[in-house]
């Protein structure tokens, strides 16, 4: 079952290392792949003393951890390199950091939900 799936055909492209990698620095990247595979957009960046440095943006291959993510949001607490992925055209144009700590179980005995 797949709910509200949005196709990804193109993503914002950026490569901070563009000269060494011999790519464009910025642009729009068409996302190619097998017809039976999903495609996503991604962004990676660093936070250097409060200043955001984009490392790369572009297309990301089929990855279940990107399913159902319409926004590109890094949720890991204090990563070295920030990463997010999402589904939908150009969904990596904006990216954000919203750390979510581990939710600890309540100490009382909760009622188990029915399946």
């Amino acid at each position: 079952a797949i709910l509200g799936r949005s196709e990804t055909q193109e993503c914002l492209f950026f490569n901070a290392n563009w000269e060494k990698d011999r790519t464009n620095q910025t642009g729009v990247e068409p996302c190619y792949g097998d017809k039976d595979k999903r495609r996503h957009c991604f962004a990676t960046w660093k936070n250097i003393s409060g200043s955001i440095e984009i490392v790369k943006q572009g297309c990301w291959l089929d990855d279940i951890n990107c399913y159902d993510r319409t926004d590109c949001v890094e949720k890991k607490d204090s990563p070295e390199v920030y990463f997010c992925c999402c589904e939908g055209n150009m969904c990596n144009e904006k990216f954000s950091y919203f750390p979510q700590m581990e939710v600890t179980q309540p100490t009382s005995n909760p009622v188990t939900p029915k399946p």
């Epitope: 797949i2 709910l3 799936r5 999903r38 279940i64 951890n65 159902d68 949720k75 990463f83 581990e102």
Partner: antibody
């Protein structure tokens, strides 16, 4: 430390039902896809089911489609596998696994044994 | 129906090198299938060795390495040790929510 603890296994008659649970700790459960993998006695590993971060997308191996339902409760850090119309060939140790980016299983539980027999 | 094939069994001498392979019936294995490798000893849960073709999981010794060899994914163990005697499974991510496990290779370390 990442921990995955399966429970709910046991002996059940053919045609019966069981619900497996996997309690997760040591990581932010709601941020990662999860999967169930099983291993019949003396056999290899077999992927059973997967679920996306929100639970909005669920996936199954052909042999369990229509009989098994995977779900998750992100507020309780728990993954579930509801197994109905159980068959002898569903007898296996069932493992839950955390899925990391590039869709691989980075952490595994210790497994819970399901035996389907009359 | 995708079938992922591995050698059913393999033997290696202590200190030797062994390469286990992982192919499938629908064509060539490439990095886009994100091949991963898992080690399992009897009665234990699997342990993640290699992911994304060639990245070692945390704590895995560098004797283990992953690659693409021809049209297959490969796991190479150099300087095999007695405690490498285990079952090894490869997994291919087929995309669209589907994984397929290989049948596993039982590795025996001789002596």
């Amino acid at each position: 430390e990442v921990q995955l603890l399966e429970s709910g296994g046991g002996l059940v008659q053919p045609g019966g039902s069981l619900r497996l649970s996997c309690a997760a700790s040591g990581f932010t459960f709601r941020n990662y896809a999860m999967a169930w993998v099983r291993q019949a006695p003396g056999k290899g590993l077999e992927w059973v089911s997967g679920i996306s971060v929100t639970g909005g997308s669920t996936f199954y191996t052909d042999s369990v489609k229509g009989r098994f339902t995977v779900s998750r409760d992100n507020s309780r850090n728990t993954l579930y596998l509801q197994m109905n119309s159980l068959r002898a060939e569903d007898t296996a140790v069932y493992y839950c696994a955390k899925v990391y980016y590039t869709s691989f299983f980075d952490y595994w539980g210790q497994g819970t044994l399901v035996t389907v027999s009359s | 129906q995708t079938v992922v094939t591995q050698e059913p069994s393999f033997s290696v001498s202590p200190g030797g090198t062994v390469t286990l392979t992982c192919g499938f019936n629908s064509g060539s294995v490439s990095t886009s299938y994100y091949p991963s490798w898992y080690q399992q000893t009897p009665g234990q849960a699997p342990r993640t060795l290699i992911y994304n073709t060639n990245t070692r999981s945390s704590g895995v010794p560098d004797r283990f390495s992953g690659s693409i060899l021809g049209n297959k994914a490969a796991l190479t163990i150099t300087g095999a040790q007695a405690d490498d005697e285990s079952d090894y499974y490869c997994v291919l991510w087929m995309g669209s929510g589907i994984w397929v496990f290989g049948g596993g290779t039982k590795l025996t370390v001789l002596g």
